[in-house]
Interface confidence: medium
């Protein structure tokens, strides 16, 4: 599905096959400004959760060396946001003995803030991106990724963790967001919907895309994920929207073709190394950036989100495979695994390009309501 405004020169226009081509302490709100944990009832908006390297058993992330193997990152315990009470629940709850944060389900109790108080923070993710209100920031230069083109060996772990499909990444994938802001990629995972129902986490002017990829990074300033949680810029996520296109995306096919092997919750397989950057849009120069949070408990804030303007195209069959192959806990399909959008609460989303320029003939002068404070080269 594409909105009429999704043209090549407008924000989020022009898809990419992807083949060739990151606030201080937790700020808990008062009752009146608590972020909503669910969208108003609507068929597109069943919220879900995020998957990140775990808190329980976090290994040290050592400096890169040629001898190191893959990081063995366990899943972060997650809790799902309540869904629309009118909708059937897609997942049952999951228990992990002695671990409060792993007891979760779509819809109903427990409320997220009870599981992790940070989930009631003022600066949460995902958010709705409104390009017209984004602050054009020329200092946001093209993203640079290093070492994302992986050889077939060593193979990588692809896992159905019950709430997403996650690919654990080896050491050596580096990403830079600016001066002194260097990151190592840890893992990537996807969020999706169900048949005929989109499932991206972020939205653009209320429009939800079919799916979304997240590549999760740890700042090189921290040796462990648990040290970085809640620290400004401690974690950074690259996010891209997945859309339907006419052709099969060969990069994604390398993962999607293996989903049947991990249909059961908790199952995993090994896949050959691949070009991770090919899973992202080819245009690294046009993106939105804001500071938010993990999209599941512990909902730690200080996460730098970079959302690409360009989308990635997958075929209809591929999107169907993504949303219709995996199973979650309790004989339920793993679908609609996204959290509701959260209020900005005064945050400004920055854009690396003039996203607020309306291409329609009605706009004589582009209105830029917000300004960028970042420094350049």
């Amino acid at each position: 599905q594409r909105l009429p405004r999704m043209q090549e020169d407008s924000p989020l226009g022009g898809g990419s096959s992807g083949e060739d081509d990151p606030l201080g302490e937790e700020d808990l709100p008062s009752e009146e400004d608590s972020p909503r944990e669910e969208d108003p009832p609507g068929e597109e908006d069943l919220p879900g959760e995020e998957d990140l390297p775990g808190e329980e058993d976090l290994p040290e992330v050592k400096p890169k060396s040629e001898e190191e193997g893959s990081l063995k990152l366990e899943d972060l315990p997650t809790v799902e946001a309540p869904g629309d009470p009118q909708e059937p629940q897609n997942n049952a709850h999951r228990d992990k003995e002695g671990d409060d944060q792993s007891h979760w389900r779509y819809g109903g109790d427990p409320p997220w803030p009870r599981v992790s108080p940070a989930c009631a923070g003022r600066f949460q993710s995902p958010v709705d991106i409104r390009p017209q209100l984004a602050a054009f920031c020329p200092a946001l230069r093209p993203l640079e990724l290093l070492g994302f083109q992986l050889p077939p060996l060593p193979e990588l772990r692809l896992r159905n963790n019950g709430h997403s499909v996650q690919l654990t990444l080896p050491p050596g994938l580096e990403m830079a967001l600016g001066p002194g802001r260097e990151y190592r990629a840890l893992q990537l995972h996807l969020h999706w919907g169900a048949a005929g129902r989109p499932g991206s986490e972020h939205t653009v002017e209320g429009h939800r895309f079919p799916a979304e990829i997240h590549v999760v990074h740890l700042s090189t300033a921290f040796a462990r994920v648990d040290e970085a949680l809640g620290r400004p810029g401690g974690l950074a996520v690259l996010a891209a929207f997945l859309e339907e296109g006419p052709e099969e995306n060969s990069a994604y096919e390398q993962l999607l073709s293996r989903l049947e092997e991990i249909a059961e919750e908790g199952s995993e397989t090994q896949v050959p190394g691949l070009d991770i950057s090919a899973l992202l849009p080819s245009d690294f120069s046009r993106y939105f950036q804001y500071e938010g949070s993990l999209t599941t408990p512990p909902c730690a804030q200080g996460v730098i989100w970079t959302v690409f303007n360009q989308t990635v195209m997958l075929s209809a069959k591929q999107l169907h495979t993504l949303s219709d192959t995996l199973w979650g806990p309790g004989d339920s399909r793993l679908q609609l695994n996204f959290r509701a959008t959260q209020p900005l609460n005064g945050r400004v989303i920055e854009a690396s390009f003039p996203a607020g320029v309306d291409s329609s003939p009605r706009a004589a002068e582009p209105v830029q309501l917000n300004s960028c404070l970042a420094a350049g080269d």
Epitope: D21, R141, L146, Q149, L177, G180, D377
Partner: antibody
């Protein structure tokens, strides 16, 4: 004004050692990725070693791995390259370079220090 | 390792004319390419990064284009100070590699 000044080069016999230094000024050194690049006569520029802003990530060219060690002292605004077991093929002009605002392309280079390995 | 091949090795151009320098990567490097200028006895100077972005202070006559495996540096109207060697470099994957260079000389 950004300045990078290399020192420590010279003539050394095969198997010998040298320690190159790069003194940086005019910018917040601790924010920047830094590299050593060499240029031998009639040969291509070659990235020898790189180090991220906090020193936690290092890279070495395969042919120097185990022989060269890159390090930095952010308190002293200095970058170093300890070169051991030097070979004739290490003869080159060695440049210290700063990476553009933490990224991977190099925006400032020193004037270089010459290393000659010969018996 | 990714091999960067520059052509031509030497380009003879008259001042005021346009110069087009080519750089081909042996595999896809997306847009992770930089262009440098080096004059005799001097260190390299960054002109272009991310394939098409002019670095701060670089004159508008220098432009970069391309993605994937084929890249071009164009100097729209050569000035006397532009006669030098030009190198492309990929920084998509280690080892970062440079092209062999194109020497732009006065015709």
């Amino acid at each position: 004004e950004v300045r990078l000044v290399e020192s420590g080069g010279g003539l050394v016999k095969p198997g010998g050692s040298l320690r190159l230094s790069c003194a940086a000024s005019g910018f917040t050194f601790s924010n920047y990725y830094m590299s050593w690049i060499r240029q031998a006569p009639e040969k291509r520029l070659e990235l020898v070693s790189a180090i991220n802003s906090d020193g936690g990530i290092t890279y070495y060219l395969d042919t120097v791995k185990g022989r060269f060690t890159i390090s930095r002292d952010n308190a002293k605004n200095s970058l170093y390259l300890q070169m051991n077991s030097l070979r004739a093929e290490d003869t080159a002009l060695f440049y210290c370079a700063r990476h553009r605002s933490g990224y991977f392309s190099m925006d400032y280079w020193g004037q270089g220090t010459s290393v000659t390995v010969s018996s | 390792e990714i091999v960067m091949t520059q052509s031509p090795a030497t380009l003879s151009v008259s001042p005021g004319e346009r110069a087009t320098l080519s750089c081909k990567a042996s595999q896809n490097v997306v847009s992770a390419v930089a262009w440098y200028q080096q004059k005799p006895g001097q260190s390299p100077r960054l002109l272009i990064y991310s394939a098409s972005n002019r670095y701060t202070g670089i004159p508008a006559r220098f432009s970069g284009s391309g993605s994937g495996t084929e890249f071009t540096l164009t100097i729209s109207s050569l000035q006397s100070e532009d006669f030098a060697a030009y190198y492309c470099q990929q920084y998509r994957n280690y080892p970062w590699t440079f092209g062999g260079g194109t020497k732009v000389e006065i015709k």
